[in-house]
Amino acid sequence: MMTGTIETTGNISAEKGGSIILQCHLSSTTAQVTQVNWEQQDQLLAICNADLGWHISPSFKDRVAPGPGLGLTLQSLTVNDTGEYFCIYHTYPDGTYTGRIFLEVLESSVAEHGARFQIP
C-alpha cells in the first residue's frame, strides 16, 4: 500500500533570465527512493539515480544543474520554460510517486512564489 505523499514547491513564478529551484520531498513512507526523474511535459530533464548519480538530458545540459538534494535548478529562464514540471519518485517497495510543479516565467520583475501544496 502506498502511504507516502509528495510535497512540492507548488505553483511558482520567476523572472526571465533568472533561475529557479524545483524541489519535491517524499514523506510519510519508509520506502527507499531508488531514482527520481524530472520531466517537463513528457520531456526528460534529468535523472537522479541513488547508486549512479545524476544524468542531465543533453538538450538541457547548458541550463539545468543538479540539486540541491534531489531537486533541480533551472537557469537562464525563458518564457518558453513556463509550464508543468513533474518529479517522479521511483521507490521500493511502494512503486512510483509523482509530484507536479507549475512554473510561470514572467517578463516583469514581479515574480512571487506560490503556496506549497501536497499530492498524495
Partner: antibody, heavy 120, light 112 residues
C-alpha cells in the same frame, strides 16, 4: 559481464526499412542509456541517438531525426533501431553501445555491429 | 556540431617505441559541471570499438598503463609509452560534452 548481442547482417532494397536489435545482458538494462552509432566506409563514426529503456526517453542527432526510430523492450532487455527510407548512403555497420550516462557520458561497452547493405 | 580533428591520419611505429595522437575540438569540451567529457576508443581490425579512456585521462579497467590521456579545453593527446603489436588499429577521440556527440576521423596505428 556486460554483453550486447546484435542481430545479423541485412541485405535490403532501397526505399524499404530495416530494424536492428541489440540484446543486453550482464547489467540492469533499465538504468543505463543505450546508444547507436553508424560506421560508413570512409566516413568514420556517427552518433545516431540514444534511448533510456527505463522510461523510453530518447535523444536523436538532428541528422537522423525522422530516419531512425529507437525503441526498447524491457521484458527482454532488447533495444531496437529502425532505419527507414533506405538509400545506398545508409549502407554501413551499425553499432549499439551502452552509454553509462550520469557523470561519465561515455559509451563503455559495444555490440559486435550489424552490417546493413542497401542494394537493388 | 562540434568538429573533432585528429592528427596524424596514420602513424607507423616500431614496437617498443612511443606514439602520440592529437585531438582538437572546435569548441571547449569543459562542461558547466566542471568535467571534460573527452573519450578515446580503439577499433582493432575487424572488431567493434573498445573504450580506452574517458573523462580525458581515466583508464578503462583492463587497459594497460602504457596508455595515458591528457589535455584540456580544446586540445587533447593520447600517448602510448611503448607500442605493442596488440595496439594496432584505429584510434578515435569523441566528445560527450555537447549535443550531438561527435567523433574524430580516426588515426590508424600501424606497426613498422
Amino acid at each position: 559481464q556486460v554483453q550486447l548481442q546484435q542481430s545479423g547482417a541485412e541485405l535490403v532494397r532501397p526505399g524499404t526499412s530495416v530494424k536492428i536489435s541489440c540484446k543486453a545482458s550482464g547489467y540492469t538494462f533499465t538504468i543505463h542509456w543505450l546508444g547507436w552509432v553508424r560506421q560508413r566506409p570512409g566516413h568514420g563514426l556517427e552518433w545516431i541517438g540514444d534511448i533510456y529503456p527505463g522510461g523510453g526517453y530518447t535523444n536523436y542527432n538532428e541528422k537522423f531525426k525522422g530516419k531512425a526510430t529507437l525503441t526498447a523492450d524491457t521484458s527482454s532487455s532488447t533495444a531496437y533501431m529502425q532505419f527507414s527510407s533506405l538509400t545506398s548512403e545508409d549502407s554501413a555497420v551499425y553499432f549499439c553501445a551502452r552509454d553509462y550516462g550520469y557523470d561519465v557520458y561515455a559509451m563503455d561497452y559495444w555490440g559486435q555491429g550489424t552490417s546493413v547493405t542497401v542494394s537493388s | 556540431d562540434v568538429v573533432m580533428t585528429q592528427t596524424p591520419l596514420t602513424l607507423s611505429v616500431t614496437i617498443g617505441q612511443p606514439a602520440s595522437i592529437s585531438c582538437k575540438s572546435s569548441q571547449s569540451l569543459l562542461d558547466s559541471d566542471g568535467k571534460t567529457y573527452l573519450n578515446w576508443l580503439l577499433q582493432r581490425p575487424g572488431q567493434s570499438p573498445k573504450r580506452l579512456i574517458y573523462l580525458v585521462s581515466k583508464l578503462d579497467s583492463g587497459v594497460p598503463d602504457r596508455f595515458t590521456g591528457s589535455g584540456s579545453g580544446t586540445d587533447f593527446t593520447l600517448k602510448i609509452s611503448r607500442v605493442e603489436a596488440e595496439d594496432l588499429g584505429v584510434y578515435y577521440c569523441w566528445q560527450g560534452t555537447h549535443f550531438p556527440r561527435t567523433f574524430g576521423g580516426g588515426t590508424k596505428l600501424e606497426i613498422k
